[in-house]
Interface confidence: medium
């Protein structure tokens, strides 16, 4: 078994953030339906979020770390699918409703687990996979996400989520954290981030930064049995106007070395 | 349990290369940075080089830089130093350590510039 | 360059805290950490990184916080294993720099 519970994969690199379990391989998700149950409600949605978005950019100034920078965080938490484990598995679930947070503001990703047995503490692992699509772009035009639904339900696949089913070897990949007991260790990439894994699994960004944006896994594994590796996933975004990324983008370029 | 073990050090000639290397096991290699860090006899610690999880990120330390060539090998688990046009100050221990805030050391390797 | 005192003493049993200052600050806050070397070119341990965290195989009694751009290394309880000198690191811009070192005398 690896240390520091690292290099622990998702299934078969598919990023589809579904529980696995010998027992059980064929354990299909459940339909994500992550803006609503129609074109019309998910224009809604995206029109809600724009005016949002427009009245926290507006009232940015008064917020020391973020004066005159037009910008906001929208994170999106999608409760990824998870099957009824057999006895002895661990059950994975990262759930929370929508967030809307200003940039540099802290921001927490739950996630927690259950096992019906615990004879050693688990290995709690986050990692970051880049949007397979660009999700801020679509997020703006809202006909190309009709066009995508359509297609989507044309297919008969309307659980499909194309921001993040893609295989890794297109998008980037990196480990975030991982914890066993009280041990946190921070992946190479987000060394001097002040992010920890708190309370059951949850992950914590006291800041939020660009670059951020991208899926983020809760991976458990339990030692007693490396197979029952369960998953769930969580949507982050960062958005801002283009004055604001030109202002933003030179003071994260001090970070970790960098690939 | 995290290793770290240098090799390569030695009794060098000055205008002379060295190639140290450092063996990693025990934990995910390819995602944490590696440094090599140095003392002099009887000084503190100096930073030399650092490399990114990838290999494709590196930085030098000002008294290196332009001598110094540092690579790894995810593969093999191993980050390997290479300093050229040797000098006297070269003299030292050099440790391999594990991440930018690091967690982990090397027993280090002693090398001789004379 | 970072600051911190040549040397303190301590009682066994007491408390002692060695201060370092002059990080670099990276991402709107700074970033030390502490490592203790008990004799002249022998390995480092690290026993403080991120401020604040401690590695799992160090005791309880060695602690790190973070005031301002000063951090502070806190051992409660000092023992005669630790005596040794103590270099703080700071992280800055891909690099990593150390003091001078503090000897700590019990």
């Known amino acids: 078994m690896q240390q520091d519970g690292l290099g622990v994969g998702t299934r078969n690199g598919s990023g589809k953030g579904r529980s696995v379990h010998p027992s059980w391989p064929w354990c299909a998700p459940r339909p994500l339906r992550y803006f609503g149950r129609d074109a019309r409600a998910r224009r809604a949605q995206t029109a809600a979020m724009a005016l949002l978005a427009g009245g926290l950019s507006r009232g940015l100034g008064s917020h020391p770390a973020a004066a005159g920078r037009d910008a906001v965080v929208f994170v999106w938490l999608l409760l990824s699918t998870w099957c009824t484990a057999p006895a002895r598995a661990i059950q994975v679930t990262v759930s929370n409703p929508y967030h809307v947070v200003i940039l540099f503001q802290p921001v927490t990703l739950p996630c927690t687990y259950q096992m019906t047995s615990t004879p050693t503490q688990p290995i709690v692992i986050w990692k970051y996979k880049s949007f397979c699509r660009d999700r801020i772009a679509d997020a703006f035009s809202p006909a190309s996400v009709d066009n995508q639904l359509n297609a989507q339900l044309a297919a008969g696949n309307p659980g499909y989520n194309p921001y993040v089913e893609c295989q890794d070897s297109v998008r980037t990949v990196r480990v975030v954290a991982t914890k066993q007991g009280n041990a946190v260790t921070l992946g190479d990439y987000y060394q001097g981030r002040r992010i920890t894994i708190t309370g059951n699994a949850d992950l914590t960004f006291d800041q939020t930064a660009w670059g951020d944006s991208g899926v983020y896994y809760c991976s458990v594994v339990s030692a007693q049995d490396l197979q029952g590796n369960n998953e769930a996933y969580a949507e982050l975004i960062v958005l801002g106007r283009t004055s604001g990324v030109a202002e933003l983008l030179p003071g994260f370029q001090a970070g970790p070395i960098e690939d | 349990a995290v290793t770290l073990d240098e090799s390569g050090g030695g009794l060098q000639m000055p205008g002379g290369a060295l190639s140290l290397v450092c063996r990693a096991s025990g934990f995910d290699f390819s995602s944490y940075e590696m440094q090599w860090i140095r003392q002099a006899p009887g000084k503190g610690l100096e930073w030399v080089a650092g490399i990114s999880g990838a290999g494709s990120g590196t930085r030098y330390g000002s008294a290196v830089k332009g001598r110094a060539t540092i690579s790894r090998d995810n593969g093999q688990s191993t980050v390997r130093l290479q300093l050229n046009n040797l000098r006297a100050e070269d003299t030292g221990i050099y440790f391999c350590a594990r991440s930018s805030n690091i967690d982990a050391w090397g027993h280090g390797t002693e090398v001789t510039v004379s | 360059a970072l600051t911190q005192p040549a040397s303190v003493s301590a009682n066994l049993g007491g408390t002692v805290k060695i201060t370092c200052s002059g990080g670099g600050r990276y991402a709107e806050s700074y970033y030390y950490g502490w490592y203790q070397q008990k004799s002249p070119g022998s390995t480092p341990v690290t026993v403080i990184?991120?401020?604040?965290k401690r590695p799992s195989n160090i005791p309880s009694r060695f602690s790190g916080s973070l005031s301002g751009s000063t951090n502070t290394l806190t051992i409660t309880g000092v023992q005669v294993e630790d005596e040794a000198v103590y270099f703080c690191?700071?992280?800055?811009?891909?690099?990593?720099?150390f003091g001078a070192g503090t000897t700590l005398t019990v």
């Open positions: 690191g700071s992280y800055e811009d891909s690099r990593s720099a």
């Open positions: 990184y991120w401020n604040d």
